[in-house]
Each structure stands twice: as C-alpha cells, then as structure tokens.
C-alpha cells in the first residue's frame, strides 16, 4: 500500500523574509533585494513600496516588512498607511481646488490641514461670547447673560434697610 503523504505543506516551514521556491524543490529562498515577505509560507515575496517624489522614507524596507512613507515638509499624510500626501495650508485657511484659501467670516481652522469649521454658537448653550472668533481660533463662550446680571448669583447679599419716608434714589 502507498504510505500516506504528510498533509503538512513543506512551504509552511519557510519563515518571513523568504519564499517557497517551487523551482528548487520547495526550499526556502531569501527574498530578493527590494522585496519582503512579512509572513511565513509565502510562494512569492512582495515588492517593497517606493517612497518617491513628495513621499519620503520613514522606515526602510527589510526582508520581513514593507517600507513606510511619510510626506516631505509642507505636506501631510492622508489615507491608510499614508497613501497620499496633501499640501499643508496655514492656520486660518483650507485647501480648495484652487489652492489654500482664507476661512470665510464665521469659520476657523486652527490646523494646517482640514477644512474651515463654523464658530461655536454660544447662544445655543445659553452662553455669551467671551472672546470673539478669528480665522484661526474658535470663539470662547462665557457664562450666560443671566449669570452676569446683578443679583443673579446663588448667594444674594441682604438688601440695605430703608428709612421710612425716604424714596429710593
């Protein structure tokens, strides 16, 4: 009778950094330069990511892990794994199709990325504006107007005694 062959795939013995070489009797061969395998048992290696142009290398590719990119100064990463670089703007601006534009009145952006957002509407919380907003900063809300009116504190001082016959001034 024919002996049962081992069910284990010989390629499963090939560690990260190698591939299972079918041309050489399934022995483990090292990944060629500029490629990697991050898991064992792979039949091919993956080509390393190239950080070119506006991308710069944050972490070099190794035989077991891909290169990692970030963006050159003046740009910031977008997308998973920094798949895109987007131009920075100044605080108080947002990036449009025509480039960086100042935030419209009533909006602000306190970062070099993202969009201009509306100032907080203090009155929705029954508060007043303590510090006005700018293109770069949101408004600062203060106590409600009622909190600021005289005699509105929780502990009211006693009213001064009035002498009879004296009308209030």
């Amino acid at each position: 009778f024919e002996r049962t062959r081992s069910l284990q795939d010989p390629c499963s013995n090939c560690p990260a950094g190698t591939f299972c070489d079918n041309n050489r009797n399934q022995i483990c061969s090292p990944c060629p330069p500029n490629s990697f395998s991050s898991a064992g048992g792979q039949r091919t290696c993956d080509i390393c990511r190239q950080c070119k142009g506006v991308f710069r290398t944050r972490k070099e590719c190794s035989s077991t892990s891909n290169a990692e990119c970030d963006c050159t100064p003046g740009f910031h990463c977008l997308g998973a794994g920094c798949s895109m670089c987007e131009q920075d703007c100044k605080q108080g601006q947002e990036l449009t199709k025509k480039g960086c534009k100042d935030c419209c009145f009533g909006t602000f952006n306190d970062q070099k990325r993202g969009i201009c957002r509306p100032w907080t509407n203090c009155s929705l919380d029954g508060k007043s504006v303590l510090v006005n907003g700018t293109k770069e900063r949101d408004v600062v809300c203060g106590p409600s107007p009622a909190d600021l009116s005289p005699g509105a504190s929780s502990v009211t001082p006693p009213a001064p005694a009035r002498e009879p016959g004296h009308s209030p001034q």
Partner: nanobody, 122 residues
Amino acid sequence: EVQLLESGGGLVQPGGSLRLSCAASGFTISAEDVGWVRQAPGKGLEWVSAILDSGGSTYYAESVKGRFTISRDNAKNTLYLQMSSLRAEDTAVYYCARYVYHAGGGVTFDLRGQGTQVTVSS
C-alpha cells in the same frame, strides 16, 4: 531561452581580489533586475548584491558593503561582481540571479547557471 553563465571564481588568499562575470543570453541585462546570490558550504542562499531597474540603483548585503561592487556592461550583456578585501567567510558558490515578477504582484528569482566557486584561504 534564458541562460546565465558565471565565471571568474577561484582560490584566493584573504585580502585578495576577484572579478566574477555573468554572461546573459535570451534577455537583455540592462532591462532586467539582476544580481548575485551565494551559497556557503552547509548554508542557505544569501543575496550579495543586485542592480535594480533601468536606473541602475544598487543593493549590497551589509556583510559585503564597501568591499564588493556590482556593475554591468550593456554592450556585452554581462553582469560583474568585483570583490576585494576577501575574507574566509566569503567562501561560497556564487550564482547570477534574475528577478522574476509574477502576475499577482509577487517577485521571486531565477538561477539558471551552475555558479562559480570562490574559495578564500591561506
């Protein structure tokens, strides 16, 4: 048919130099990613050096940096490995290798030659 023929190996004393050649046929060496792989006695394959893409960017293993230089002569369709300051641990069979790119996006390599033996010993 793709063929790679290595030559230039031999016995050399520690500190000595050798130049290996790899004559390619069946493909244009300048249009491919190629390099050198070695196998020391009782050990697995180790990448030594490579020339990648048509721009000619080069790779060297840490163990040979500053001592080995890879180059190619496009007119002769030949790849070279200039080895200097040789050490006993450089003793191995040296193979010329050609990258193989697969449809799924992966990469392996192809060894078509018999290799050339380099022995560093006093």
